[in-house]
C-alpha cells in the first residue's frame, strides 16, 4: 500500500560540474524498517521484469556492504526516517532524475528527485525593491539556489566593479523545504548612484570567480543643480547688473518646474533657468538659489550670496547695560548697516568726539557718574561715511554723593533747645527716597531729611544721617556740642577726714560732674550769706559758731546749679555751763528747789556731776538737782560739771539761800 510511504525533500536540486550536491530528505515507512535502498539515475520501470532499470549510483545490501565504486555517492540516512544523500563531486551527466528505491519487509517505493547540473557555475540572481529613492535605505538580495556542505562558496557585492563597504549578511539553507545561499546588503543610495552597475559575484572558498549577476541602479532623486553667477564673486555696487544661471546636472525622473528664491522666499515671475537683475539696490543683497522640481520633489542649488555694496547707513548705539551702576563695566556697540563692513568708527559723547575710539565696540571698565549722557557714532567703509544716528542714553546710577549732616540752629546749642538738623547731599541717581539717622530710634523719625529734636538733652553728643536711594550714603557724624549748666553739684568735705572738732582746720570742696562751657564760677553761702567764690571753703580754726547749713553754687554762661544744703557739724566739749535755780536763788525752807546745769555742747552732755561749796561731789548725775523739802542747811554755793565725748566743762559757783519759814521764826 503505497500510501504508507511519505517523503519530504526539495523537488529539484541545482549544481554544476565538479561541485557537489547535498539532498536533504526524510521519509516514513509505517510497516517497518528499511531493508534495501538503491539510488537510480533516470530509472525506467520494466513491465516485463516488474523491476526498475537504470544506472545504479548507490546500492545498500542486506549485509550492509557498499561496493567501493559507490564512494562518490553517500546515503546519509537510516532505516526509518532519514534519506539524506550526498554526491561529491557531481558531474554534468548526473543531471536528470534520481530514483530512490526503498524496500521494507512488505512494501516497496520509488521516490523521484530532479537534479540539474550545469556545465559551469550558474549565476546568482539579484533582487531589487520595486523603487529606489535617494537616501532611503534599501535591502539588496543576491540569491543562489545552491548550497553544499562539501563545497564552500561566497557571494560578494561590487559597485562599478569595486567591492562595496557596507557589510553584507550571508545565510544558507539546507533543509527538506529549500536549498540556497543568500546575501543581503543594506544600502542607502545617493543620487550619484543612479545608473551605476551593482554586481553580485559568486566565488569559491579561495575567492576565485565562478559567476555573477549585474543590475543597473535606477535611483529616483530630486533635480541636482549648479548655479553660476556673473560677476563670479557676486560682489557688486548699487546700479550694477547681475546674471544667474541654473544648470540641471541630474534629475530622475525628468524635471517639471523651475523657480528662483531669495533668502528662502520665491521670486515672482522668475521661471526660467536664467535670472537677470538690472540696476541692483542694496535691498537685493541676499542669498539666491534656484529650485527645480520633479515627481520626487524640489531640488535646490547651493546659495549664492549676492553682496550689493553701499556706504554705511545712519548708525544706532546699543548699550550693555543701562542704567549702569557706578564702578561697573559698560560696553557700547555701534550698529550700522554697511557693505563692506565698516572699517573705522568715530564715537561721540554728548556731541563731543571721543579721542582714540575707532572700534565698533567701546568698553569702559569702571563707569563713573560723568560717563552718563548721550553716546552716538559714525561708521565708515570704502564707499563712504555714514550719518550719525540719534544716539543712546547712558544712565549712571550711584549712591548719594557728599552727604552732610547740617545743624540749622544758631550756635551754641543749649540744653532744652529745639534742634533742627538737615541731611544734605550733592547729587544722587536715582533720587533720594528716604533718610536714616544715627543714633537709631532715639527721636521721632523725620520724614523729609529734617530731624527736629525737641528739648535737646545735655548728653546728646553726636548725630549722623544717611541719604538713601538704592543705596545709603552716611555722612560723617557731627557733634551737637550742647551747652548746659554745671551738673551734679555737691559739697564734699576734704579735711579733716574724720569728724570736725572745734579748733580743727576744715576744707570743703564744691564738686560738679560736668559743665559746658567748662569755665565756671563758684559761690559759697550759709543761711543766705555769701562766704566765698573759690571751689574750696577753708576754716583755719573752726568754731562751734561755724556750724550750720552750707550750699555751693556753680555757674557758667548757660546757668547756675546749686548743691543740696550740706550741714557742717562742729564737735566741742561742754561750754558756757551755768547753774540755774528754780523758783529762784532764795527759797523758803520746806519748799522745793531745782538746780539745772545748763550747757552748750556737741555732742550733747552725756554725764553730769554736782559739787557743793566744799567741792564735794554730790550723789546726783542728772542735769537737774531737786531739793525737796529744802532745808536751811542746804544754803551755800553749788557748781556742776558736764561731760561729752569731746571733754568736760564746769560752771561757776551759784549760791542758793534757804531762809526760815514764818513758822520756824514764830517758834523762835
Amino acid at each position: 500500500d503505497s500510501s504508507k510511504w511519505v517523503f519530504e525533500h526539495p523537488e529539484t536540486l541545482y549544481a554544476w560540474e565538479g561541485a557537489c550536491v547535498w539532498i536533504p530528505c526524510t521519509y516514513r515507512a509505517l510497516d517497518g524498517d528499511l531493508e534495501s535502498f538503491i539510488l537510480f539515475h533516470n530509472p525506467e520501470y520494466n513491465k516485463n521484469t516488474s523491476k526498475f532499470d537504470g544506472t545504479r549510483l548507490y546500492e545498500s545490501t542486506k549485509d550492509g556492504k557498499v561496493p567501493s565504486e559507490q564512494k562518490r555517492v553517500q546515503f546519509l540516512g537510516d532505516k526509518n526516517k532519514n534519506c539524506t544523500l550526498s554526491i561529491h563531486p557531481v558531474h554534468l551527466n548526473d543531471s536528470g532524475q534520481l530514483g530512490l528505491r526503498m524496500e521494507s519487509k512488505t512494501e516497496k517505493w520509488m521516490e523521484r528527485i530532479h537534479l540539474n547540473v550545469s556545465e559551469r557555475p550558474f549565476p546568482p540572481h539579484i533582487q531589487l525593491p520595486p523603487e529606489i529613492q535617494e537616501s532611503q535605505e534599501v535591502t539588496l538580495t543576491c540569491l543562489l539556489n545552491f548550497s553544499c556542505y562539501g563545497y564552500p562558496i561566497q557571494l560578494q557585492w561590487l559597485l562599478e566593479g569595486v567591492p562595496m563597504r557596507q557589510a553584507a549578511v550571508t545565510s544558507t539553507s539546507l533543509t527538506i523545504k529549500s536549498v540556497f545561499t543568500r546575501s543581503e546588503l543594506k544600502f542607502s543610495p545617493q543620487w550619484s548612484h543612479h545608473g551605476k552597475i551593482v554586481t553580485c559575484q559568486l566565488q569559491d572558498a579561495d575567492g576565485k570567480f565562478l559567476s555573477n549577476d549585474t543590475v543597473q541602479l535606477n535611483v529616483k532623486h530630486t533635480p541636482k543643480l549648479e548655479i553660476k553667477v556673473t560677476p563670479s564673486d557676486a560682489i557688486v555696487r548699487e546700479g550694477d547688473s547681475v546674471t544667474m544661471t541654473c544648470e540641471v546636472s541630474s534629475s530622475n525622473p525628468e524635471y517639471t518646474t523651475v523657480s528662483w528664491l531669495k533668502d528662502g522666499t520665491s521670486l515672482k515671475k522668475q521661471n526660467t533657468f536664467t535670472l537677470n537683475l538690472r540696476e541692483v539696490t542694496k535691498d537685493q543683497s541676499g542669498k539666491y538659489c534656484c529650485q527645480v522640481s520633479n515627481d520626487v520633489g524640489p531640488g535646490r542649488s547651493e546659495e549664492v550670496f549676492l553682496q550689493v555694496q553701499y556706504a554705511p547707513e545712519p548708525s544706532t548705539v546699543q548699550i550693555l547695560h543701562s542704567p549702569a551702576v557706578e564702578g561697573s563695566q559698560v560696553e557700547f556697540l555701534c550698529m550700522s548697516l554697511a557693505n563692506p563692513l565698516p572699517t573705522n568708527y568715530t564715537w561721540y559723547h554728548n556731541g563731543k568726539e571721543m579721542q582714540g575710539r575707532t572700534e565698533e565696540k567701546v568698553h569702559i571698565p569702571k563707569i563713573l557718574p560723568w560717563h552718563a549722557g548721550t553716546y552716538s557714532c559714525v561708521a565708515e567703509n570704502i564707499l563712504g561715511t555714514g550719518q550719525r544716528g540719534p544716539g543712546a542714553e547712558l544712565d549712571v546710577q550711584y549712591p548719594p554723593k557728599k552727604v552732610t549732616t547740617v545743624i540749622q540752629n544758631p550756635m551754641p546749642i543749649r540744653e532744652g533747645d529745639t534742634v533742627t538738623l538737615s541731611c544734605n547731599y550733592n547729587s544722587s541717581n536715582p533720587s533720594v527716597t528716604r533718610y536714616e539717622w544715627k543714633p537709631h530710634g532715639a527721636w521721632e523719625e523725620p520724614s523729609l531729611g529734617v530731624l527736629k529734636i525737641q528739648n535737646v538733652g545735655w548728653d546728646n553728643t553726636t548725630i549722623a544721617c544717611a541719604a538713601c536711594n538704592s543705596w545709603c550714603s552716611w555722612a560723617s557724624p557731627v557733634a551737637l556740642n550742647v551747652q548746659y549748666a554745671p551738673r551734679d553739684v555737691r559739697v564734699r568735705k576734704i579735711k579733716p577726714l574724720s569728724e570736725i572738732h572745734s579748733g580743727n582746720s576744715v576744707s570743703l570742696q564744691c564738686d560738679f560732674s560736668s559743665s559746658h562751657p567748662k569755665e565756671v564760677q563758684f559761690f559759697w553761702e550759709k543761711n543766705g550769706r555769701l562766704l566765698g567764690k573759690e571751689s574750696q571753703l577753708n576754716f583755719d580754726s573752726i568754731s562751734p559758731e561755724d556750724a550750720g547749713s552750707y550750699s555751693c553754687w556753680v555757674n557758667n554762661s548757660i546757668g547756675q546749679t546749686a548743691s543740696k544744703a550740706w550741714t557742717l557739724e562742729v564737735l566741742y566739749a561742754p561750754r558756757r555751763l551755768r547753774v540755774s535755780m528754780s523758783p529762784g536763788d532764795q527759797v523758803m525752807e520746806g519748799k522745793s528747789a531745782t538746780l539745772t546745769c545748763e550747757s552748750d555742747a556737741n555732742p550733747p552732755v552725756s554725764h553730769y556731776t554736782w559739787f557743793d561749796w566744799n567741792n564735794q561731789s554730790l550723789p546726783y548725775h542728772s542735769q537737774k538737782l531737786r531739793l525737796e523739802p529744802v532745808k536751811v542747811q542746804h544754803s551755800g554755793a553749788y557748781w556742776c560739771q558736764g561731760t561729752n565725748s569731746v571733754g568736760k566743762g564746769r560752771s561757776p559757783l551759784s549760791t542758793l539761800t534757804v531762809y526760815y519759814s514764818p513758822e520756824t521764826i514764830g517758834r523762835r
Epitope: R434, K438, P439, H440, G441, A442, E444, E445, S447, G457, D459, N460, T461, T462, P477
Partner: antibody, heavy 115, light 107 residues
Framework: QVQLQQPGAELVKPGTSVKLSCKAS?????SYWINWVKLRPGQGLEW???????????NYNEKFKSKATLTVDTSSTTAYMQLSSLASEDSALYYC????????WGQGTTLTVSS | DIQMTQSPASLSASVGETVTITCRAS??????LAWYQQKQGKSPQLLVY???TLADGVPSRFSGSGSGTQYSLTINSLQPEDFGSYYC?????????FGAGTKLELK
C-alpha cells in the same frame, strides 16, 4: 502711663507660623520705634529688628531676615511679629520694647515649638 | 555690625560694696549706650541711657560713664534689690546689639 502688652504664651507645631502681638498704650504710637528682642535661656538678649509705626519702615538683624516679618496696625496701636517655618530653636521668650534705648518693655511672650 | 563685649560674665559681691561692669564696643558708638537690669522672671529695665543719663526713678547709686568704645556701669553701696543680670546695648546704628550680660550674685 506707657504700657506694652503681650500675650503670655503661644504653643505651636514645627513647620508652622505664628504671629505675636504687642499692644501699645499711653503714648503717641506712631512716633516711636518698636523693637523685638529674643531671649533664650543661657543665650542673652538678641535684637530681631524694629519697625517705625509712622511709616512702616523696618530694620532687621540679618540673622532673622528670613524668619521674622514685622508689621503694625496703627488703628489698634498694635505691633506684630510673624515667625515662619518654626523649629525647636525658635522656642524662646520674645519681648517688644519701645525706642532705640529700650525705655519700656512688654512682659514677653513665651513661644514653645513642639509636636 | 558693632559687637559689644561685656565683662565680667559673673560677679559676686556683698551688700554695701561698690561694683563696676564694663562694656567695649567694636566701633565708636558716640555715647549711645544703654544699661539694663533684669531680674529672674521679669522684663529688662532701663537704668542708664546716653552712657551716663539715669532713667527716671533709678537710684543715684547707679552711674554710667565712658566714651568712644569703652563704657562702664558702677553701682555704689550695693543693696539687696540690686542683684540680678545686667546688659549693655548700643543704639548708634542698626543692628542694635547687646552685651552677653553680667550676672551679679550675693557673696
Amino acid at each position: 502711663q506707657v504700657q506694652l502688652q503681650q500675650p503670655g504664651a503661644e504653643l505651636v507645631k514645627p513647620g508652622t507660623s505664628v504671629k505675636l502681638s504687642c499692644k501699645a498704650s499711653g503714648y503717641n504710637f506712631t512716633s516711636y520705634w518698636i523693637n523685638w528682642v529674643k531671649l533664650r535661656p543661657g543665650q542673652g538678649l538678641e535684637w530681631i529688628g524694629d519697625i517705625y509705626p509712622g511709616s512702616g519702615n523696618t530694620n532687621y538683624n540679618e540673622k532673622f531676615k528670613s524668619k521674622a516679618t514685622l508689621t503694625v496696625d496703627t488703628s489698634s496701636t498694635t505691633a506684630y511679629m510673624q515667625l515662619s517655618s518654626l523649629a525647636s530653636e525658635d522656642s524662646a521668650l520674645y519681648y517688644c520694647a519701645r525706642r532705640g534705648y529700650l525705655d519700656y518693655w512688654g512682659q514677653g511672650t513665651t513661644l514653645t515649638v513642639s509636636s | 555690625d558693632i559687637q559689644m563685649t561685656q565683662s565680667p560674665a559673673s560677679l559676686s559681691a556683698s551688700v554695701g560694696e561698690t561694683v563696676t561692669i564694663t562694656c567695649r564696643a567694636s566701633g565708636n558708638i558716640h555715647n549711645y549706650l544703654a544699661w539694663y537690669q533684669q531680674k529672674q522672671g521679669k522684663s529688662p529695665q532701663l537704668l542708664v541711657y546716653n552712657a551716663k543719663t539715669l532713667a527716671d526713678g533709678v537710684p543715684s547709686r547707679f552711674s554710667g560713664s565712658g566714651s568712644g568704645t569703652q563704657y562702664s556701669l558702677t553701682i555704689n553701696s550695693l543693696q539687696p534689690e540690686d542683684f540680678g543680670s545686667y546688659y549693655c546695648q548700643h543704639f548708634w546704628s542698626t543692628p542694635l546689639t547687646f552685651g552677653a550680660g553680667t550676672k551679679l550674685e550675693l557673696k
